[in-house]
Amino acid sequence: HTAAQDNCTCPTNKMTVCSPDGPGGRCQCRALGSGVAVDCSTLTSKCLLLKARMSAPKNARTLVRPNEHALVDNDGLYDPDCDPEGRFKARQCNQTSVCWCVNSVGVRRTDKGDLSLRCDELVRTHHILIDLRHRPTAGAFNHSDLDAELRRLFRERYRLHPKFVAAVHYEQPTIQIELRQNTSQKAAGDVDIGDAAYYFERDVKGESLFQGRGGLDLRVRGEPLQVERTLIYYLDEIPPKFSMKRLT
């Protein structure tokens, strides 16, 4: 697991404890909360990051209209159960034995139930729509420059392959970034769009997960792009199952 050898830290995850106790005295880093060894050459899974966070001290409109199955993470933080690979377990429960099913990004996709609730499989989130509003600028950003800069950001900072950034829409002051990655497209070693979206969300909130790296300094042709609101929609390969009561 690649970690910075000189001072034994994890460049891609500051919510880790690192020590030179790996093979041959190599630096090895474990996620806070779970103690799972993480690969510091890539992004840490959102499940392990959430667990670590819980353990830490506390005209022609071009914009996409999310469909009726789009999920928004309204439940906020919780202490998740992760599998040995760091993925969310399909069923999550709290200390009071209230359980619910989640998708691959850990967002609830069913009504809450009790311990008898069954979640047969972890349903993949294959389409993520990141909806941003930027702070005032002297003028609108050039769409193609904005598109190129955001694609570069996801490629270089989050190591997400460009083929998974499906589109960048812009209608001042709203920017939408569409990430698409279905099960068959994601190869071994590919960063998951859910993890990339979570790192991006934390970056724009000024809560970077990267070790020792400065905050996100997004610029389009030299002009700063400062995000003041973020809303993320998650679309699953199988639509969520909520009762009609929730939908009204």
Partner: antibody
């Protein structure tokens, strides 16, 4: 601590030119918009000019066409050049720092001020 | 050109709560942005008490707060002190230029 030090004020002649310099310290100069605000004797605050971290500029109506704002990131300085001086340019000129890098025109974002430099335009 | 509207003067006894309103700023796609600047004497440097509607610089006491409702921003001083006596200017923007209100004189009785 953030400090902004202005220089270049003093007695100026009508029709002449003025160059004010503000040196910033205690913050990452390149990351923030900077600007100039002035106050004529007995009057309120007036936006003069500003420059964003990406070097886009904005000017107040009273100085548009006569003023040029520029910056030297390496020296952490912002400069205001004001030509064709008039008696109504007499004021205390304050250097101001934005809390953001973005558009220079949003005085709502000013989070720090210099002590000011007095300019008197008189023959 | 837009003009910011704020009261010319307000007064309060020590310990009371004071509210100063500012309206007329430019609309940026449904959002309005304001800042508040305290000047204790003419020619003395202004001090930012609130910027970007609600943000308070670290050196400003917590009794100063800002809030926005629609196109109006309100500076609230909770438990006003004698030292708060000053002129308070609000600032916003009008398309490509910054604008300031005429100032509100706060007198602490």
């Amino acid at each position: 601590a953030v400090t902004l030090d202005e220089s270049g004020g003093g007695l100026q002649t009508p029709g002449g030119a003025l160059s004010l310099v503000c040196k910033g310290s205690g913050f990452t100069f390149s990351s923030y918009a900077m600007g100039w605000v002035r106050q004529a004797p007995g009057k309120g605050l007036e936006y003069v000019a500003a420059i964003s971290s990406g070097s886009s500029t904005g000017y107040g109506a009273a100085v548009k066409g006569r003023a040029t704002i520029s910056k030297d990131t390496g020296q952490s300085t912002v400069r205001l050049q004001l030509n064709n001086l008039r008696a109504e340019d007499t004021a205390t000129y304050y250097c101001a720092k934005s809390g953001y890098g973005g558009s220079a025109s949003y005085v709502s974002d000013i989070d720090a001020w210099g002590h000011g430099t007095e300019v008197i335009v008189s023959s | 050109a837009l003009a910011l509207t704020q009261p010319s003067s307000v007064s309060a006894n020590p310990g009371e709560t004071v509210e100063i309103t500012c309206s007329g700023g430019g609309d940026y796609y449904g959002t309005y942005y304001y800042g508040w600047y305290q000047q204790k004497a003419p020619g003395s440097a202004p001090v930012t008490v609130i910027y970007d509607n609600t943000k308070r610089p670290s050196n400003i006491p917590s009794r100063f707060s800002g809030s926005t409702s629609g196109s109006t921003n309100t500076l609230t001083i909770t438990g006003v002190q004698a030292d708060d006596e000053a002129v308070y200017y609000c600032g916003s923007y009008d398309s490509s230029a910054g604008i300031f209100g005429a100032g509100t004189t706060l007198t602490v009785l």
